[in-house]
Interface confidence: low
Amino acid sequence: SAPGEDEECGRVRDFVAKLANNTHQHVFDDLRGSVSLSWVGDSTGVILVLTTFHVPLVIMTFGQSKLYRSEDYGKNFKDITDLINNTFIRTEFGMAIGPENSGKVVLTAEVSGGSRGGRIFRSSDFAKNFVQTDLPFHPLTQMMYSPQNSDYLLALSTENGLWVSKNFGGKWEEIHKAVCLAKWGSDNTIFFTTYANGSCKADLGALELWRTSDLGKSFKTIGVKIYSFGLGGRFLFASVMADKDTTRRIHVSTDQGDTWSMAQLPSVGQEQFYSILAANDDMVFMHVDEPGDTGFGTIFTSDDRGIVYSKSLDRHLYTTTGGETDFTNVTSLRGVYITSVLSEDNSIQTMITFDQGGRWTHLRKPENSECDATAKNKNECSLHIHASYSISQKLNVPMAPLSEPNAVGIVIAHGSVGDAISVMVPDVYISDDGGYSWTKMLEGPHYYTILDSGGIIVAIEHSSRPINVIKFSTDEGQCWQTYTFTRDPIYFTGLASEPGARSMNISIWGFTESALTSQWVSYTIDFKDILERNCEEKDYTIWLAHSTDPEDYEDGCILGYKEQFLRLRKSSVCQNGRDYVVTKQPSICLCSLEDFLCDFGYYRPENDSKCVEQPELKGHDLEFCLYGREEHLTTNGYRKIPGDKCQGGVNPVREVKDLKKKCTSNFLSPEKQNSKSN
């Protein structure tokens, strides 16, 4: 049984009747096949469900799909397949839902082989109505919405053409041929790579990076000898082939590719890769793969320009390009990230950082857990978290770690307690302080989700047998109650709640199987009557984030400031509500050396907060390439950590002088960059 299932638990009274009145079953008139579900808009209650069923015939595959719509968070569904003329929808493209609350939806249809182009169904009223549009091309990718204007769409065709629509898919124009990869930037800018000779694969490392800021009227070549590119926060990254050999280096731009600087990162060879693990407007986490097929690399964290990098974590587990990494941003607490390292003995261990990659440490052993067989010392061990890598290895882990920005401090994850990740059946652990301390929450693997900004946690046991029981907790996972939502158990396939964790509805998806047929079924449970009243001021308590030593004036200082949050008391059973906004009071901290990273030409010796000059650069003029010019740096070795808000205290001096020398590093310098018009 789950920890806390004892008499001391604050029970929610009469919950069975309250939940029974708010449990809604919908049986889909459908053969099983596959199902995909999308939420349309925020707080609209609109859900689209697409069921597809393939009938393999001798010569071809005959497909059938059905489209259902709910506008009450999944309590009731209406079959709207006729709105898309009973057309078979291609599930590999999914349902392309527009940004924000645009209410836009694009479905890509399956068409017969000989047709001139593809077909889409478009809705701009939250899927109440659809318009059929025949395309002048066959799409290779899902339609991509401009983040700034949901009327602007781009898509790649099967013939590598870049197509753009300015009227939400009504009319399409091919703006460029021979395109490998295209992405929306900010301000409706499109970045894309093109090949000149054979193909995307053949020209890898010889691609050109182009930009259009006017949807294809004019173009600018912003890079050559490109291997690939990526966008992260306000940074544009490109990996560029070196002149002399097959290595490549990362270049970075913060002005949409007008000027470039070489990132102070190791170059990589043909078999290696770079990966942007996380990026925001302040900084970036970059993974650089080790040479050879090691399965690991090094995490570097950038300065505010994305140019100077500090080594953050060695032996970071990342299997292959596009492979698996456990790197997870804990969104419920600023500065916290969790990932896995491959230790010397090839075991996998979890590491956590609370200061945006400054320092990494093992996760503290949960109070209520014993060390498992992987532990050499039965009294000293750590918690190790199962994430993407474990899931890819088909371990009994149904879900990755979960955190939500509006459920402050809460992190839920599968894990094991020992010296390394164990292949044994994991349990579910919870942290209520952003990863500093952990408690075993549920025995064995579960699906879990957060409702009402953390006011309710819902879980379902991961089992191969049919299930009919759901567990819920109103005190951040300390105590659990079980509710039987149906007499007839179902084969469970998924738990769905509205993104953002503000909803009080949960949908349990599964199928029923009888001798003759199997059908999709959903149960939607509304917890509003469990949380009978709205939360008041007395239901919240002050919590200082990142607090480790209440006697220290610096307690809670991370990246130069501390934050006090108003958090729901565990004992309060009430509704945060859909409009709940996290209340936080920041206060600035004094600067110490911890608030600075080591500047170019400097490094931090192990367990020291001072930056010292790199021996090989001692006595040399510090010159480096910035915005395509040689710069001279006068520094005492420190640069403020991106996003750090400290004031006063230690204030190291830093000055950069322009040496007026060019250093384009085989990248086009601004003077050479040519503009082209259509």
């Epitope: 002050i542 200082l544 209440p550 006697e551 220290d552 004036y553 610096e554 809670g556 200082c557 501390k562 006090q564 009071q585 920041p586 206060s587 600035i588 901290c589 004094l590 600067c591 110490s592 050396l593 911890e594 907060s609 808000k645 004031q647 006063g648 205290g649 230690v650 204030n651």
Partner: antibody, heavy 129, light 107 residues
Amino acid sequence: QVQLVQSGAEVKKPGASVKVSCKASGYTFTSRYMSWVRQAPGQGLEWMGIINPVGGSTSYAQKFQGRVTMTRDTSTSTVYMELSSLRSEDTAVYYCARDPSGIAAAGPASRYYYGMDVWGQGTTVTVSS
Amino acid sequence: EIVMTQSPATLSVSPGERATLSCRASQSVSSNLAWYQQKPGQAPRLLIYGASTRATGIPARFSGSGSGTEFTLTISSLQSEDFAVYYCQQARLGPWTFGGGTKVEIK
């Protein structure tokens, strides 16, 4: 010697704004924060906010958020406090005070508060229709 | 925010006697506390910082003690110039907050 000299008394109508200045001398202006504290007639002291003269960054008490703006001019070693949308309850003496929050003791983990050690003479602001 | 509560509101003491003023914080402020003296028509003056360290030029008869949530300012032998209002102030967590003050008057 170290001193803070504030601008003279002001009489303002409700809804107006007031800008009080505080000129520092006798020490390195950028080496210390500056706090602003007010005192209504017959009442206690109320902290309004703090400014770091180095970069001009500020931290305001919630009560004054949106109404108060603290700025500094390093060329004249002067800090300013502007309060807008004045109401009668803003009638008070406004003090600037040197706040050595900007001193870090040795080592990153040690924080030590030295108190507001130098105060201006105060500026009386009267809000009346 | 951290609430600072001073007691008593008024303390009547004869010159030469000992005065003990109390200050309580709603949560721990460690030793990040200062005491100020204010006389009518004047700006406050720093007496004690770091809960127990006398500021420059402050006579030895003033002493501070305490840490966490309970603090005390002691004036061992009151002089005529010591009759004033005394405030405590925390600087552990923003916003800085003051106590309501204790008025020390002649008995």
